[in-house]
């Protein structure tokens, strides 16, 4: 692989745990310039595997509120609007990064944390286990 | 209100941009102790709104690899295994936090960034607009 030279303007870290502890600019840059986050707002109702959104709140974490999807049914909604139990509603999960103050109550010291969140649900064909 | 005292073990920041720039411990704590991330690994094939996963790689970002979902069809797979265009496959999107090296190529200096990622797809009833 190509070795990219270290930028001479990089800040130095005197921290004894370096490089585990790094400097982070908290002024968030938003890359989603052409996106409209509202566009998927009603999928949870219109989906054949609809879901409810539950509030997961922790003031010591950033973001403090995370909305978690919980599938409404075990099965999926068919063309007649009924639940078809030959199909399964399953959560689509994703690991996301969050910030947590560490040590607690320190204004300028944080730790990255990885948490698994359910973003929505999808309808899948079940895996059928045949008993011999 | 009660004033919570600052933890005496808090690190100091000598950075000229402080307090926008803070110390973050990258030794990531994983809260997903009881979860099995593999359990949703085949949903992209079994879903009635199947998707392909595309590798989005950027060495200047953490995490450097993000998997992006792209729905395979405009419609959804019906019981016969055919695409039903009376239904729509749509991406479920979520905004996530990532770290970007800033200045570029610096090993210990980052900026928070927010990006929109497609996590998977779900099958929805279309919104029909009637023309007068």
């Amino acid at each position: 692989g190509i070795t990219i030279p270290r930028n001479p303007g990089c800040p130095n870290s005197e921290d004894k745990n370096f490089p585990r502890t790094v400097m982070v600019n908290l002024n968030i840059h938003n890359r989603n310039t052409n996106t409209n986050p509202k566009r998927s707002s009603d999928y949870y109702n219109r989906s054949t595997s609809p879901w409810n959104l539950h509030r997961n709140e922790d003031p010591e974490r950033y973001p403090s509120v995370i909305w978690e999807a919980k599938c409404r049914h075990l099965g999926c909604i068919n063309a007649d609007g009924n639940v078809d139990y030959h199909m399964n509603s399953v959560p689509i999960q994703q690991e996301i990064l969050v910030l947590r103050r560490e040590p607690p109550h320190c204004p300028n010291s944080f730790r990255l944390e990885k948490i698994l969140v359910s973003v929505g649900c999808t309808c899948v064909t079940p895996i059928v286990h045949h008993v011999a | 209100g009660i004033t919570i005292p600052r933890n005496p073990g808090c690190p100091n920041s000598e950075d000229k941009n402080f307090p926008r720039t803070v110390m973050v411990n990258l030794n990531i704590h994983n809260r997903n102790t009881n979860t099995n991330p593999k359990r949703s690994s085949d949903y992209y094939n079994r879903s009635t709104s199947p998707w392909n996963l595309h590798r989005n790689e950027d060495p200047e970002r953490y995490p450097s690899v993000i998997w992006e979902a792209k729905c395979r069809h405009l419609g959804c797979i019906n019981a016969d295994g055919n695409v039903d265009y009376h239904m729509n496959s749509v991406p479920i999107q979520q905004e996530i936090l990532v770290l970007r090296r800033e200045p570029p190529h610096c090993p210990n200096s980052f900026r928070l960034e927010k990006i929109l990622v497609s996590v998977g797809c779900t099958c929805v009833t279309p919104i029909v607009h009637h023309v007068a």
Epitope: D42, L53, R55, P59, V65, W67, C106 | R20, E95
Partner: antibody, heavy 124, light 109 residues
Framework: QVQLQQSGPGLVKPSQTLSLTCAIS??????????WGWIRQSPSRGLEWLGR?????????DYAVSVKSRITINPDTSKNQFSLQLNSVTPEDTAVYYC??????????????WGQGTLVTVSS | EIVLTQSPATLSLSPGERATLSCRAS???????LAWYQQKPGQAPRLLIY???NRATGIPARFSGSGSGTDFTLTISSLEPEDFAVYYC??????????FGQGTKVEIK
């Protein structure tokens, strides 16, 4: 362009119910990226957040502890508006009442659109 | 509940001067959930800054915000005649904890 238009009486008698309505144009009360709140302002209390409603597959109501036992905020999806009801009012509830849109994007929270304000006087 | 204390209560300055307004929280708040508003007599508050340092749409570059933890600052680099008003900071810690500071009045000297 999002706008909020407030309506309701400016005079309420002690022990009665204060009722205000906020009509939304340019956005939806059922939006999943916003919450809709009420804030009041008086010389004695300054700006005081009273509560909010937000829709995320169901309606969520959050109320300030100071008024929790007396307040109700309701949506009216058919008219795209929301209302405030504050029961058992006293002269201490005299204030300018504002409705506002709270941007609620998970990563930020702030009030970007405000109603024009309604001065409500509690007096017999 | 988190108390936001703004200082000074009144700031007397001339047009063209730099204004520095302080907002101190009784506990740590996430900078991402800290906002600043401007209010003129007879008007509703107007959003200036969100996320401690992001200017709202249409807000001139002379307004800037900074801070983290418990200490936040709003700076107006060079006061214009229309900037004389009352300024409020506001924090969101949780869905039930949302508070405003008592305000700083910037008046013409």
């Amino acid at each position: 362009q999002v706008q909020l238009q407030q309506s309701g009486p400016g005079l309420v008698k002690p022990s009665q119910t204060l009722s205000l309505t906020c009509a939304i144009s340019g956005d939806s009360v059922s939006s999943s990226s916003a919450a809709w709140g009420w804030i009041r302002q008086s010389p004695s209390r300054g700006l005081e957040w009273l509560g909010r409603i937000s829709y995320r597959s169901k309606w969520y109501n959050d109320y300030a502890v100071s008024v929790k036992s007396r307040i109700t905020i309701n949506p009216d999806t058919s008219k795209n508006q929301f209302s405030l009801q504050l029961n058992s009012v006293t002269p201490e509830d005299t204030a300018v009442y504002y409705c506002a849109r709270e941007v609620d994007s998970m990563y930020y929270s702030y009030f970007d659109i405000w109603g024009q304000g309604t001065l409500v006087t509690v007096s017999s | 509940e988190i108390v936001l204390t703004q200082s000074p209560a009144t700031l007397s300055l001339s047009p063209g001067e730099r204004a520095t307004l302080s907002c101190r929280a009784s506990q740590n708040v996430w900078a991402f959930y800290l906002a600043w508003y401007q209010q003129k007599p007879g008007q509703a508050p107007r959003l200036l800054i969100y996320g401690a340092s992001n200017r709202a749409t249409g807000i001139p570059a002379r307004f800037s915000g900074s801070g983290s933890g418990t200490d936040f600052t709003l700076t107006i680099s060079s006061l214009e005649p229309e900037d004389f008003a009352v300024y409020y900071c506001q924090q969101y810690r949780s869905t039930l904890s949302l508070t405003f500071g008592q305000g700083t009045k910037v008046e013409i000297k």
